[in-house]
């Protein structure tokens, strides 16, 4: 019987060009976490295997850093990074637990107001 629950950072926003930490936490279960997959829509971004360590998708290795903990750090954010992210905890013997995070990447305030401060 699956008794665990996943807590996430929920809906978050960040500025374009900045970075953000995606975090999930599995609680209320004694199941062993074997692997955590991080996905964006249907695309696998990264995995952290308890024995075999972190692996980042080649498509994202320049902008994704492992951690802290089982979380994921996204860097050099673009507006295209807006969307749903999922942490999928593979646990023994329970099975999989999935958490959802929605990230909105906003135009930075510098980009929005930069034209006002142009040097003549």
């Amino acid at each position: 019987m699956m008794t665990g629950t996943i807590e996430t950072t929920g809906n978050i926003s960040a500025e374009k060009g900045g970075s953000i930490i995606l975090q999930c936490h599995l609680s209320s279960t004694t199941a062993q976490v074997t692997q955590v997959n991080w996905e964006q829509q249907d695309q696998l971004l990264a995995i952290c295997n308890a024995d075999l360590g972190w692996h980042i998708s080649p498509s994202f290795k320049d902008r994704v850093a492992p951690g802290p903990g089982l979380g994921l750090t996204l860097q050099s954010l673009t507006v295209n990074d807006t969307g749903e992210y999922f942490c999928i905890y593979h646990t023994y013997p329970d099975g999989t637990y999935t958490g959802r995070i929605f990230l909105e990447v906003l135009e930075s305030s510098v980009a929005e107001h930069g034209a006002r401060f142009q040097i003549p």
């Epitope: 062993q32 074997t34 692997q35 696998l44 995995i47 295997n49 308890a50 024995d51 075999l52 692996h55 980042i56 998708s57 080649p58 290795k61 593979h90 646990t91 023994y92 013997p93 329970d94 099975g95 999989t96």
Partner: nanobody, 118 residues
């Protein structure tokens, strides 16, 4: 159920080379992380190397970096560990490991013995 069978171990002189193979059963091989651990006599099992994304992502223990190379052939469901410049301290039983979605835990092979001695 995922099953792993290692081969390629044996006796080699210091400075020599060996290539270990790990044949995996199961349909999800190409999407899984795979790797190698080793256990020397009287010591704890230690991580050696792992691979994912068809070889685009590899990780090595500091003790083998520059000497060992991990690779995978998805068409053969096989992972390899090329071991060069072997040292006596590389003597150990080498185990192949991969994640098994069948039962939500890592599957381990039975191991293959590597002995480095003159």
């Amino acid at each position: 159920e995922v099953q792993l069978v290692e081969s390629g171990g044996g006796l080699v002189q210091p400075g020599g080379s060996l290539r270990l193979s790990c044949a995996a059963s199961g349909p999800t091989f190409s999407t899984n992380v795979m790797g190698w651990f080793r256990q020397a006599p009287g010591k704890e099992r230690e991580f050696v190397s792992s691979i994912h994304w068809g070889g685009s992502s590899t990780v090595y223990a500091d003790s083998v970096k520059g000497r060992f190379t991990i690779s995978a052939d998805n068409s053969k469901n096989t992972a390899y560990l090329q071991m060069n410049s072997l040292k006596p301290e590389d003597t150990a039983v080498y185990y192949c490991v991969t994640y098994s979605a069948y039962d939500f835990r890592n599957a381990w092979g039975q191991g293959t013995l590597v002995t480095v001695s003159s």
